[in-house]
């Protein structure tokens, strides 16, 4: 039985050209996290964080994605095309797969405030 829940940074906004941290946290389960995958709105993989082996940033994103903090991901040099959904997929044993959703809005305005709050999707 899957008892865990994923908390995420929820809906966030950030300035074009800036950076943003995507964060998820799995709680309420004793399952072992074997891998966390970060995916973009078009379902392309951004990065994989393997519990034993560390980070693999996908070749297409190496210049704009930085691992961490923790199991999170930092997107840099944001463009308007980065607006959309992001997913953290926790692969666990023996529970199976947990998935969290974050919506990022990239704003042109120089007054765009980076909002980040933890919420359960």
């Amino acid at each position: 039985m899957m008892t865990g829940t994923i908390e995420t940074t929820g809906n966030i906004s950030a300035k074009k050209g800036g950076s943003v941290i995507l964060q998820c946290h799995l709680s309420s389960t004793m399952a072992q996290v074997t891998q966390v995958n970060w995916e973009q709105h078009d379902h392309s993989l951004l990065a994989i964080r393997n519990a034993e082996l560390g980070w693999h940033i996908y070749p297409a994103f190496k210049d704009r994605v930085a691992p961490g903090p923790g199991l999170g991901l930092t997107l840099q040099s944001l463009t308007m095309n980065d607006t959309g959904e992001y997913f953290c997929t926790y692969h666990t044993y023996p529970d199976g797969t947990y998935r969290g959703r974050i919506f990022l809005e990239v704003l042109e305005s120089s007054v765009a405030e980076h909002s980040a709050r933890f919420q359960i999707p």
Partner: antibody, heavy 120, light 107 residues
């Protein structure tokens, strides 16, 4: 260049423990991931598990209760132990390196493989 | 576990002609797929990673494509040295799993 060489008995009796060692040259096993993969006769490849640069291990759940992967950093080698073997464990066993940072879960260096037959 | 199903099981190709191998995942693995070639009497060798990136030293006649559940390895012009068994592998989730293999022969 990274080179891997498997060694161990080619014949193991049923219910006994299969033990193999992989000697690594040209690279330190305190970097990257060191894997065991097997190939039963006429079949595909099966991941057994790996030991990481820090010594942490991951085992395929289908074999987890019978597998131990360990390492000896002073000899730059790592080992596989598979207990309670049956004829189904007859296979070519490969040791392999995986550079997770650059290639994800894709294996970039393989040993030449060693054939292990389980038979009385 | 994710099952990787390869088709065809075998392929006989005239030198200089193209060849295509398909790999289907039992669930969405995004682009976390690698391809290997196991030449006769040898260990597997990495050809493609991340679905479409050629590994160092792999000739450009080899190309990988696909995402989600459907992946393809193409050889634009098959050469005699390309014979062997080709395997796909997913690393989207553990345990990482391989396809059953496709044997490529020369006519």
């Amino acid at each position: 260049e990274v080179q891997l060489q498997e060694s161990g008995p080619g014949l193991v009796k049923p219910s006994e423990t299969l033990s193999l060692t992989c000697a690594v040259s040209g690279y330190s096993i305190t970097s990257d991931s060191w894997n065991w993969i097997r190939q039963p006769p006429g079949k595909g490849l099966e991941w057994i598990g790996y030991i990481s640069y820090s010594g942490n291990t991951y085992y395929n759940p289908s074999l987890k209760s019978r597998v131990t992967i360990s390492r000896d950093t002073s000899k730059n080698q790592f080992s596989l132990k598979l207990s309670s073997v049956t004829a189904a464990d007859t296979a070519v066993y490969y040791c392999a390196r995986l550079d997770f940072s650059n290639y994800g879960g894709a294996v970039d260096y393989w040993g030449q493989g060693t054939t292990v037959t389980v038979s009385s | 576990d994710i099952v990787m199903t390869q088709t065809p099981l075998s392929l006989s190709v005239t030198p200089g002609q193209p060849a295509s191998i398909s790999c289907k995942a039992s669930q969405n693995v995004r682009t976390a797929v690698a391809w290997y070639l196991q030449k006769p009497g040898q260990s597997p060798q990495l050809m493609i990673y991340s679905a479409s990136y050629r590994y160092t030293g792999v000739p450009d006649r080899f190309s990988g494509s696909g995402s989600g559940t459907d992946f393809t390895l193409k050889i634009s012009r098959v050469e005699a040295e390309d014979v062997g068994v080709y395997y796909c592998q997913q690393y989207y989730t553990t345990p990482w799993t391989f396809g059953g293999g496709t044997k490529v022969e020369i006519k």
